[in-house]
């Protein structure tokens, strides 16, 4: 399964789209910045097998897709860019799912690392809570956009490490 190469390209496209989605100057939102506690250790490709790493990537993309598929998100972003971004994420999810199935069939390794999946879910819960507390304000969404770009960058780096392992 040659996931990392195709997935990295998709991730880069998603990052570019997310960069283009900015609607207000982030410099008007400096006071709204927040530490969401990105679980960076979950993006350390050395600590688990390829299948488990792929399942963490899948969870990250899935949660990002869910976050940007809400009604509140639709109201916050320019529709055509949001649709392109969501389509890119959806394509990545399909690639990841196919890859996990292939890896499990070939390697027989466990499908996921429960602790890592839970860490990613809690991270997105913190993001959702922040948006709720900030009443989905434009600045709150701008802060979240930067944070998701950061997390997507981390997952891109994990993919690079996976490629070196292959």
């Amino acid at each position: 399964c040659d996931l990392p190469q195709t997935h990295s390209l998709g991730n880069r496209r998603a990052l570019i789209l997310l960069a283009q989605m900015g609607r207000i100057s982030p410099f008007s939102c400096l006071k709204d910045r927040h530490d969401f506690g990105l679980p960076q250790e979950e993006f350390d490709g050395n600590q688990f097998q390829k299948t488990q790493a792929i399942s963490v990537l899948h969870e990250m993309i899935q949660q990002t897709f869910n976050l940007f598929s809400t009604e509140d998100s639709s109201a916050a972003w320019e529709q055509s860019l949001l649709e392109k971004f969501s389509t890119e994420l959806y394509q990545q999810l399909n690639n990841l799912e196919a890859c996990v199935i292939q890896e499990v069939w070939m390697e027989g390794t466990p499908l996921m690392n429960e602790d890592s999946i839970l860490a990613v879910r809690k991270y997105f819960q913190r993001i959702t809570l922040y948006l709720t507390e900030k009443k989905y304000s434009p600045c709150a969404w701008e802060v979240v956009r930067a944070e998701i770009m950061r997390s997507l960058s981390f997952s891109t780096n994990l993919q690079k490490r996976l490629r070196r392992k292959d």
């Epitope: 570019i16 960069a19 410099f27 400096l30 930067a146 944070e147």
Partner: antibody, heavy 120, light 111 residues
Framework: QVQLQESGTVLARPGASVKMSCKAS????????MHWVKQRPGQGLEWIGV????????TYNQKFKDKAKLTAVTSANTAYMELSSLTNEDSAVYFC?????????????WGQGTTVTVSS | DIVLTQSPASLAVSLGQRATISCRAS??????????MHWYQQKPGQTPKLLIY???NLESGVPARFSGSGSGTDFTLNIHPVEEEDAATYYC?????????FGSGTKLEIK
């Protein structure tokens, strides 16, 4: 690899204007903010402002609002800074620097600097 | 504007010893879990190089002998053990609010 190539040394008269360039390569130019920083000889660093090449959005240090104008041409992957009404105080090295880590606003890659000398 | 006061202005440290540089902000640069203070190294005739971001995060490729700490208004850069190649001027920079500002710099000399 990421590179920021700045224009060469500039000698200008007081009251004149100068426009310096910063050509970016090795990364997606339109998706990173670009900062500009001033350093006077033997002195510290001063943040001038920042531009987002993707849409031309700019934010300035109020101190430089009437002094510096930041622009970018995406087709050329180049950012520009124009300094107007030059005085001796504007004699300095000017760096373009790429924004890093999104909204942490640190600077990872720096151009080699453009030296501006204002003299009559 | 937030003023960053660095001390000392210069220091001389013996090879292998510890160098400690302080940066004090006139107003807190920490919000909601992050401290928006960063450290750079500038060698003569060179461009500044990012060492530490968000007060304590070591930039990729920077030797582990560099470390940063602090929150609110008081921040510290430590270098231990100091090596010859560490002779440079060190600047702190905040990104807590506009305008971003730099400290006046600390010149490190190796004895």
């Amino acid at each position: 690899q990421v590179q920021l190539q700045e224009s060469g040394t500039v000698l200008a008269r007081p009251g004149a204007s100068v426009k310096m360039s910063c050509k970016a390569s090795g990364y997606s130019f339109t998706t990173y903010w670009m900062h500009w920083v001033k350093q006077r000889p033997g002195q510290g660093l001063e943040w001038i402002g920042v531009i987002y090449p993707g849409n031309g959005d700019t934010t300035y240090n109020q101190k430089f609002k009437d002094k510096a104008k930041l622009t970018a041409v995406t087709s050329a992957n180049t950012a520009y800074m124009e300094l107007s009404s030059l005085t001796n105080e504007d004699s300095a090295v000017y760096f373009c620097t790429r924004n890093y880590k999104y909204d942490y606003y640190t600077m990872d890659y720096w151009g080699q600097g453009t030296t501006v000398t204002v003299s009559s | 504007d937030i003023v960053l006061t660095q001390s000392p202005a210069s220091l001389a440290v013996s090879l292998g010893q510890r160098a400690t540089i302080s940066c004090r902000a006139s107003k807190s640069v920490s919000t909601s879990g992050h401290s928006y203070m960063h450290w750079y190294q500038q060698k003569p005739g060179q461009t500044p190089k990012l060492l530490i971001y968000l007060a304590s995060n070591l930039e990729s490729g920077v030797p582990a002998r560099f470390s940063g700490s602090g929150s609110g208004t008081d921040f510290t850069l430590n270098i231990h053990p100091v090596e010859e190649e560490d002779a440079a001027t060190y600047y702190c920079q905040h990104s807590g609010e506009l305008p971003f500002t730099f400290g006046s710099g600390t010149k490190l000399e190796i004895k």
